[in-house]
Interface confidence: medium
């Protein structure tokens, strides 16, 4: 989780003005409770927005807006902090609005944004607006929260952002995965156009069932370049069990740009269907 | 290199059901499927079944209903339990590693072939079924 | 089930023999069969796979040949330690089944 540096972050609007400041996720506010505090954020709002950096770079960063309540409570309101949580991993980000002039009703609704918290692709975020300063102990919460998922690299925005291209959102493998016969599966992918090694994981699963009953891992040295965009071949051979019939391949390159950590492709091979009752095999094979 | 020992009661009582363990050392149960094979006297060598680390198990259809295999890949072991025994399954039962790999490399198409078989055996444990 | 016959059941032979087991399968097993040797009281012990690859650390007077539903297990030279008990294994499908096992003692 970061911040867009772009820019100086400005949070002022006419008839109001407000610093953006970093914050430790601790308002004072907790430390020293008021006795008269604003209410809650209304209609908090989280999109999915791109912005440019100004190396020329696309990220997607979580847009954020929201309103005030109309009452009285304004003239108590001294800013805001907005908090992202990433999920998976509990890391936490917050800055802080500080209004430097008191607010005053007028004929709109107060209605503020943020969009400088760059997000991750396929990753949840958990997105919090507390007015400040937060209630006493025992109070009525003032804040509101929402999560937000981004999506992932195949989403057609997001494959073209700095963070996707560089995991290898543009390669396209277009896996094609046949069974040959009993024991083998004959996967075909497309190379991309760098002198990179890829590796094949595959997963087998019984009818119906999560556990796997097979699982190896093969390794494709890396192509010529002559061999860029064309179509690689793998058959692989399989111990033979009755019901280990459903095969995940997954392909994992590994492109310089994001090494361990490339987007990886799959394609899944479902166990063939099975007739309700079982047909007599012939003793021969007919002509017609 | 990996060895396997089985443990467990050399007596078991008829209608009584008779687990073995197998203890796997010098290497990890992870990746291979684990068998359990087992020799009546003064006959051939009968597969009881198998199973993955993942708990993926096969039987031999003529044991299945009497056979539970599992693994513990905390203490890399994996178990027998055969129920309901009779005299006929007193016998010498082992336990074996199933699995290697070999990778025939072509040019531009590539060749993975998985040879099985049980390539590493434990040295056996008698079970006697009488009363 | 895939049914593994041996032949023959037993065999006499002398040191310096050349010995040649048959193993058939009811069914073709491609090459999916392995060899084993068995020594009273002991454990079977692989000695090709693959129907003819030679297990590491077996000496090169044993080679197996075959696939589908007909392999045979040579010993070119036999040697006073090779006097035991041998099976072949399919592992082509479940359930796994061995030969009834071909004994070779001394003539």
């Known amino acids: 989780l970061r911040l867009l540096d772009h820019r100086a972050l400005v949070c002022s609007q006419p008839g109001l003005n407000c610093t953006v400041k970093n914050s430790t996720c601790l308002d004072d506010s907790w430390i020293h409770p008021r006795n008269l505090t604003p209410s809650s954020p209304k209609d908090l709002q989280i999109q999915l927005h791109f912005a440019h950096t100004q190396q020329g770079d696309l990220f997607p960063v979580a847009h954020i807006e929201w309103t005030l309540q109309t009452d009285a409570s304004i003239l108590y309101l001294e800013g805001a902090e907005l908090s992202v949580l990433q999920l998976n991993t509990n890391e936490r980000l917050c800055v802080r609005f500080e209004f430097l002039s008191k607010l005053r009703h007028h004929h709109r609704r107060w209605r503020f944004t943020f969009s400088h918290f760059v997000v991750d692709p396929d990753q949840e975020y958990e997105v919090t607006v507390h007015h400040l300063p937060k209630p006493i102990p025992d109070g009525d919460p003032n804040h509101q929260s929402k999560n937000f998922l981004v999506p992932d690299c195949e989403h057609a925005r997001m494959k073209v952002t700095t963070p996707c291209m560089s995991s290898g959102s543009l390669w396209d493998p277009n896996i094609t995965v046949e069974t040959l016969e009993a024991h083998q599966l004959r996967v075909s992918f497309t190379l991309w156009n760098e002198s990179t090694h890829y590796q094949i994981l595959l997963t087998s699963f019984p009818h119906m069932e999560n556990h796997s009953c097979f699982e190896h891992m093969h390794h494709i040295p890396a192509p010529r370049p002559e061999e860029f965009h064309q179509r690689s071949n793998v058959t692989l051979t399989l111990r033979n069990l009755k019901g280990c019939c459903r095969h995940q391949v997954q392909i994992q390159p590994f492109f310089s740009s994001c090494l361990n950590d490339c987007l990886r492709h799959s394609a899944t091979v479902s166990c063939p269907e099975m007739p309700d009752t079982p047909e007599p095999i012939p003793d021969y094979m007919p002509l017609w | 290199q990996v060895q396997l020992q089985e443990s467990g009661p050399g007596l078991v009582k008829p209608s009584e059901t008779l687990s073995l363990t197998c203890t796997v050392s010098?290497?990890?149960?992870?990746?291979?499927?684990w068998n359990w094979i087992r020799q009546s006297p003064g006959k051939g060598l009968e597969w009881i079944g198998d199973?993955?680390?993942?708990?993926?198990?096969n039987y031999n259809p003529s044991l299945k209903s009497r056979v539970t295999i599992s693994v513990d890949t905390s203490k890399n072991q994996f178990s027998l339990k055969l129920s309901s025994v009779t005299t006929a399954d007193t016998a010498v039962y082992y336990c074996?590693?199933?699995?290697?790999?070999?990778?025939?490399?072509?040019?531009?198409?590539?060749?993975?072939?998985?040879?099985?078989?049980?390539?590493?055996w434990g040295q056996g444990t008698t079970v006697t079924v009488s009363s | 089930d895939i049914l593994m016959t041996q032949s023959p059941s037993s065999l006499s032979a002398s040191v310096g023999d050349r010995v040649t087991i048959t193993c058939r399968a009811s069914?073709?097993?491609?090459?999916?069969l392995g060899w084993y040797q068995q020594k009273p009281g002991k454990a079977p012990k692989r000695l090709i796979y693959?129907?003819?690859s030679l297990q590491s650390g077996v000496p090169s007077r044993f080679s197996g040949s075959g696939s589908g539903t007909e392999f045979t297990l040579t010993i070119s030279s036999l040697q006073p330690e090779d006097f035991a008990t041998y099976y072949c294994?399919?592992?082509?499908?479940?359930?796994?089944?061995f030969g009834p096992g071909t004994k070779v003692d001394i003539k």
């Open positions: 074996a590693r199933d699995g290697e790999l070999a990778n025939y490399y072509g040019s531009g198409s590539y060749q993975f072939y998985y040879y099985y078989g049980m390539d590493v």
């Open positions: 010098g290497g990890s149960i992870s990746n291979y499927y």
């Open positions: 199973i993955y680390y993942s708990g993926s198990t």
């Open positions: 069914q073709g097993i491609r090459n999916d």
């Open positions: 693959a129907a003819s």
């Open positions: 294994l399919q592992h082509n499908s479940n359930p796994f089944t």
